[in-house]
Interface confidence: low
Amino acid sequence: ALDAAYCFRNVQDNCCLRPLYIDFKRDLGWKWIHEPKGYNANFCAGACPYLWSSDTQHSRVLSLYNTINPEASASPCCVSQDLEPLTILYYIGKTPKIEQLSNMIVKSCKCS
Amino acid sequence: ALDAAYCFRNVQDNCCLRPLYIDFKRDLGWKWIHEPKGYNANFCAGACPYLWSSDTQHSRVLSLYNTINPEASASPCCVSQDLEPLTILYYIGKTPKIEQLSNMIVKSCKCS
């Protein structure tokens, strides 16, 4: 799996999970989240050569097409596969609210 | 929806469905498929600015992050959303076989 266990331990040009820390205030301009101040969102990036973690038959076809026609603009892209929620604390007036934001943390990637 | 009805009628730099005809023999090196000789596979490509057909909360966060940090390499990617199968005819010896290959045709796209 193209997850932290594999990707963070290897130097990998191909599609893999990349570390990314997002500070809510600085990076998103969000001032409404009280806790946490930021989080490890991660992201997916890298090349998608033939059969590298292809998601669908179409992405396999596209990567094979790209191998034979490497200069063509049609190629699969490295995107998130498994995502996890993030629990946040914010305030409405003086009332604290705890909420779970779905699909906030990328855990693994795929070529799609 | 970022489908043919919208994308093929508009000049769109942002994430959209793009036409792509694949010839099995020439483009993939596949000689085993008898019919069709090729098909309209299509593909997805284009930029993913903030809120442009974002797939998940993470892709929305990432596109907002990319707006504020445009030099960063972390940004959502334009990938396939809806896919359809393709029916093919091939031979095993002299015996014709009809099979449906799943997820071969891209019908719409998303930023993920």
Partner: antibody
Framework: EQQLVESGGGLVQPGGSLRLSCAVS????????VNWVRQAPGKGLEWIGY???????YYASWANGRFTISKDSAKNSVYLQMNSLRAEDTAVYFC???????????????????WGPGTLVTVSS | DAVLTQSPDSLAVSLGERATINCQSS????????LSWFQQKPGQPPKLLIY???TLTSGVPDRFSGSGSGTDFTLTISSLQAEDVAVYYC????????????FGGGTKVEIK
């Protein structure tokens, strides 16, 4: 700012070898294809070859065998190794990236942008 | 392998007049429109003006335009300015050819 800068040019004797470097900044070699193009003094442009974002190298038919393109993504550099050099290889050598249009690599469009300033290679005894 | 032939080799045009450069390919360029035009001034690298046969690169004045499809292409400067004095090259992209790209021989544009 996205930039490419060539280095390693100079005077070399016929039959000799030379390795040119193309240092890139502002973008990742994991995401872009980089080409080598040359221009003999007072002549036109001639495509040598490229190395794709995935690491595959492709060459013009005349360059195959004598010229080798490689890259080191960690060092943000692309290289052109030239062997068995001849007087007719005297030229300014440019590296140029495939541009991107709306996030999609343009590839076959031959849309090369940006370019490096070039480095002069002189093959003479 | 593909050969791109530009005509004329040189062109002298009065300021404010129209300049037209032709580019003919010995075989169809990929997708019928994978042709670019470059401008080169002495001591400088080439500058991309037009890609996809007719799409103007960002920042290029709209007096430049490109047209054509398949094997025959044209670059037009509608009203020549002093800063347009340069050598102009066409470049084509090809699929299934051992040479993926080819440049035309160049056309020198001067003021009459």
């Amino acid at each position: 700012e996205q930039q490419l800068v060539e280095s390693g040019g100079g005077l070399v004797q016929p039959g000799g070898s030379l390795r040119l470097s193309c240092a890139v900044s502002g973008f990742s070699l994991s995401s872009y294809t980089v080409n080598w193009v040359r221009q003999a003094p007072g002549k036109g442009l001639e495509w040598i070859g490229y190395i794709s974002y995935g690491g595959s190298a492709y060459y013009a038919s005349w360059a195959n065998g004598r010229f080798t393109i490689s890259k080191d993504s960690a060092k943000n550099s692309v290289y052109l190794q030239m062997n068995s050099l001849r007087a007719e290889d005297t030229a300014v050598y440019f590296c140029a990236r495939h541009m991107q249009v709306g996030g999609a690599p343009t590839g076959s469009m031959a849309a090369f942008d940006p370019w490096g300033p070039g480095t002069l290679v002189t093959v003479s005894s | 392998d593909a050969v791109l032939t530009q005509s004329p080799d040189s062109l002298a045009v009065s300021l404010g007049e129209r300049a037209t450069i032709n580019c003919q390919s010995s075989q169809s360029v990929y997708n019928n429109n994978y042709l670019s035009w470059f401008q080169q001034k002495p001591g400088q690298p080439p500058k991309l003006l037009i890609y996809g046969a007719s799409t103007l690169t960002s920042g290029v004045p709209d007096r430049f335009s490109g047209s054509g499809s398949g094997t025959d292409f044209t670059l037009t400067i509608s009203s020549l300015q002093a800063e347009d004095v340069a050598v102009y090259y066409c470049a084509g992209g090809y699929s299934g050819s051992s040479d993926k790209y080819a440049f035309g021989g160049g056309t020198k544009v001067e003021i009459k």
